[in-house]
């Protein structure tokens, strides 16, 4: 019973996802004290970000609606030190952050992290201003890492009659135009909870009109063809679904993709069992279906994106969201999203406060980073279908795509299967005809060290994954399997399998 037969549907792609399907975010709270944006100047962080290109970098979060651009604001001493240290260099071949500045900021970061998390839990948000230097820092990080910046604008700046006040956005657009910064835009974050956060209720129709106003601003600027995404609502519970519907009716015409957010759990109460529970993983399915129902009933054909998503809200679950255990949720969400037709999934966060980051405060990559990197290298944009034969086996979850054609090791027609084993025994996967005797490369991820699933280090096919140096990612070495052998997937592990020479015409 530990041998499992798979079924594939490869006649034609179910969906086509974006080359930037797996994308990342920087939470806007990083700009609460703009000095900490200097971390984005780290060459190591940029190397890690470059590994995930092509991808979007969304700058957004609750703080989006409490940030105000002040073009006259002076840079901090630390920011000036950073920019001065870069003066004689190619902006993208950045030298390190000045050591004294980095040391000072690192020592202050744990306190700042607590400030940000406390603000979040107490739902008491204060306005902060950010300067031209902050915008430069963000844009340079994205641009030098090969990421496309999506900038979230403050939607809580309102006139007396609750229309959106676009004057601050205009200042930012003018500055970005002057610097020839090419980026996309959002307006507001989780507007469904504005009442809770700011004692202001904005209905979906009003928000739709606000988006039209922003679109008009963009058309008048050098951003004539800039993309606009929204409304970044939370999970589609009744009132939020209604808000999304009325928003799309009023303003759906001007957005390029519909964005919504999803978290499985509350970070304060989540348990290891939750992270490994197929019932928890499956709740995502109904949320996706609900969003698609709303879109189909108002703006059919409009692309749907997960504009912010992770395992647990509130910064993640301590000792869980940054461990190997988080990978089950992350990989399953990627698989389900692709299978159900979501075009882009933005992971909260690439780097920043909390526990759900891909890269920690020392700029060291965590298990979900390595999982994301493998996904980028191996998984293509054409989505196919794999399923487990026989009775429903929700503890064994399988997904199938054409292999990434940008990977020089593989060729058009190859297949990438990725699988998650939530059983406590090894499962052996058997490929269907005509693939069972093909050469297969295995990329098995398992935790390293005594902490097991709660480890923050990971092995690929038995080799520990770590950076070669600050500028170099390690090679991701495959393990070729004997043709015709079943694909072993140990208990509580996940793996990619590339089926070579599959010659699938749909790919």
């Amino acid at each position: 019973q530990d041998v499992v037969d798979l079924d594939f549907f490869t006649q034609q792609p179910l969906h086509l996802v974006s080359p930037s399907f797996l994308s990342v975010t920087i939470d806007a709270n990083l700009a609460t004290d703009p000095r900490f944006l200097i971390f984005l100047g780290s060459p190591k962080l940029r190397t890690l970000a470059r590994g995930l290109s092509p991808a979007y970098l969304r700058f957004g979060g609750t703080k989006t609606d409490f940030l105000i651009f002040d073009p006259k604001k002076e840079s901090t001493f630390e920011e000036r030190s950073y920019w001065q240290s870069q003066v004689n260099q190619d902006i993208c071949k950045s030298g390190s952050i000045p050591p004294d500045v980095e040391e000072k900021l690192r020592s202050e970061w744990p306190y700042q992290e607590q400030v940000l998390l406390r603000e979040h839990y107490q739902k008491k948000f204060k306005n902060s201003t950010y300067s031209r230097s902050s915008v430069d820092m963000l844009y340079t990080f994205a641009n030098c890492s090969g990421l496309d910046l999506i900038f979230g604008l403050n939607a809580l700046l309102r006139t007396a009659d609750l229309q959106w006040n676009s004057s601050n956005a205009q200042l930012l657009l003018d500055y970005c135009s002057s610097k020839r910064y090419n980026m996309s835009w959002e307006l507001g974050n989780e507007p469904n909870s504005f009442l809770k956060k700011a004692d202001i209720f904005i209905n979906g129709s009003q928000l739709g009109e606000d988006f039209i106003q922003l679109h008009k601003l963009l058309r008048k600027s050098t951003f004539k063809n800039a993309k606009l995404y929204g409304p970044d609502v939370g999970q589609p519970r009744r009132k939020t679904a209604e808000m999304l519907k009325s928003f799309l009716k009023a303003g759906g015409e001007v957005i390029d993709s519909v964005t919504w957010h999803h978290y499985y759990l509350n970070g304060r109460t989540a348990t290891e069992e939750d992270f490994l529970n197929p019932d928890v993983l499956d709740i995502f399915i109904s949320s996706v279906q609900k969003v698609f129902q709303v879109v189909e009933s108002t703006r059919p054909g409009k692309k749907v994106w997960l504009g912010e998503t992770s395992s647990a809200y509130g910064g993640g679950a301590p000792l869980l969201s940054d461990t190997f255990a988080a990978g089950f949720m992350w990989l399953d969400k990627l698989g389900l999203s692709a299978r159900m037709g979501i075009e882009v999934v933005m992971r909260q966060v690439f780097f920043g406060a909390g526990n759900y980051h891909l890269v920690d405060e020392n700029f060291d990559p965590l298990p979900d980073y390595w999982l994301s990197l493998l996904f980028k290298k191996l998984v293509g944009t054409k989505v196919l279908m794999a399923s487990v034969k026989g009775p429903k086996r929700r503890n064994l979850r399988v997904y199938l795509h054409c292999t990434n054609t940008d990977n020089p090791m593989y060729k058009e027609g190859d297949l990438t299967l990725y699988a998650i084993n939530l059983y406590n025994v090894t499962k052996y996967l058997r490929l269907p005809y005509p693939f069972f005797d093909k050469q297969v490369d295995k990329y098995l991820l398992r935790p390293l060290g005594p902490h097991g699933l709660l480890s923050k280090a990971v092995q690929l096919n038995g080799q520990t994954l770590k950076m070669v140096d600050d500028q170099t990612l390690p090679p991701l070495m495959e393990k070729p399997l004997r043709p015709g052998s079943s694909l072993g997937l140990p208990a509580f592990s996940y793996s990619f399998f590339v089926i070579r020479n599959a010659k699938v015409a749909a790919c």
């Epitope: 229309q163 129709s205 009109e209 039209i212 106003q213 008009k216 058309r219 009325s246 009716k249 009023a250 015409e253 001007v254 390029d256 189909e296 009933s297 108002t298 059919p300 054909g301």
Partner: antibody, heavy 122, light 106 residues
């Protein structure tokens, strides 16, 4: 270059159902994500939007006509159709099929059929 | 319900500027579109998204939209511009047309 051509009977009796078809040539009805529309114009009067359909079958109708309209699509024939039930003399008009100028912008039409005159009379 | 109001007729001398208005509460919060229709012909889109001109439409056609009013302006009006003009907007999943304005070139 996409072209649209309306077809159907020019005369319909009161209380019957008006049926028109729009044939799309020069492009596929199911590519590009366009909303395919019906618009009418009463003699000597202005334009009135009837409704539109997406290739997946999702429809949107003018609220004032909603109870009498059915718009359907046949991707295999590259056609979409209008049915208007319980017609009266007030439904006498030139009926146009139209397509928006862009797949993102549903409400502005840059490709129109030449129109077909439908008279409701016994 | 949403109604776009246009003057029934506007007259202009050749070479002068003609302005046709389209009104509705907070129309400036939406995008306005304009069509030209000559007798016996199908409508032609002349302005989209308030002020954009489709390819092939002469530069003398321009548009604006703010407050409660969208305006179609034809500068240096020519005899060939004599036609009916319709404004149009999108309101909550429905398309709404104005009643039309007959432009007469004197």
């Amino acid at each position: 270059q996409v072209q649209l051509q309306e077809s159907g009977p020019g005369l319909v009796k009161p209380s019957q159902t008006l049926s028109l078809t729009c044939t799309v040539s020069g492009g596929s009805i199911s590519s590009g994500g366009y909303y395919w529309s019906w618009i009418r114009q009463h003699p000597g009067k202005g334009l009135e939007w009837i409704g539109f359909i997406y290739y997946s079958g999702s429809t949107f109708y003018n609220p004032s006509l909603k109870s009498r309209i059915t718009i359907s699509v046949d991707t295999s024939k590259n056609q979409f159709s209008l049915k208007l039930s319980s017609v009266t003399a007030a439904d006498t008009a030139v009926y146009y099929c139209a397509r928006p100028y862009s797949s993102s912008w549903y409400g502005a039409f840059d490709i129109w059929g030449q129109g077909t005159m439908v008279t409701v009379s016994s | 319900s949403y109604e776009l109001t246009q003057p029934p007729s506007v007259s202009v001398s050749p070479g002068r500027t003609a302005s046709i208005t389209c009104s509705e509460d907070k129309l400036g919060n939406k995008y306005a579109y304009w069509y030209q229709q000559k007798p016996g012909q199908s409508p032609v889109l002349v302005i989209y998204q308030d002020s954009e001109r489709p390819s092939g439409i002469p530069e003398r056609f321009s548009g604006s939209n703010s407050g409660n009013t969208a305006t179609l302006t034809i500068s240096g009006t020519q005899a060939m511009d004599e036609a009916d003009y319709y404004c149009q907007a999108w309101d909550s999943s429905t398309v709404v047309f104005g009643g039309g304005t007959k432009l007469t070139v004197l």
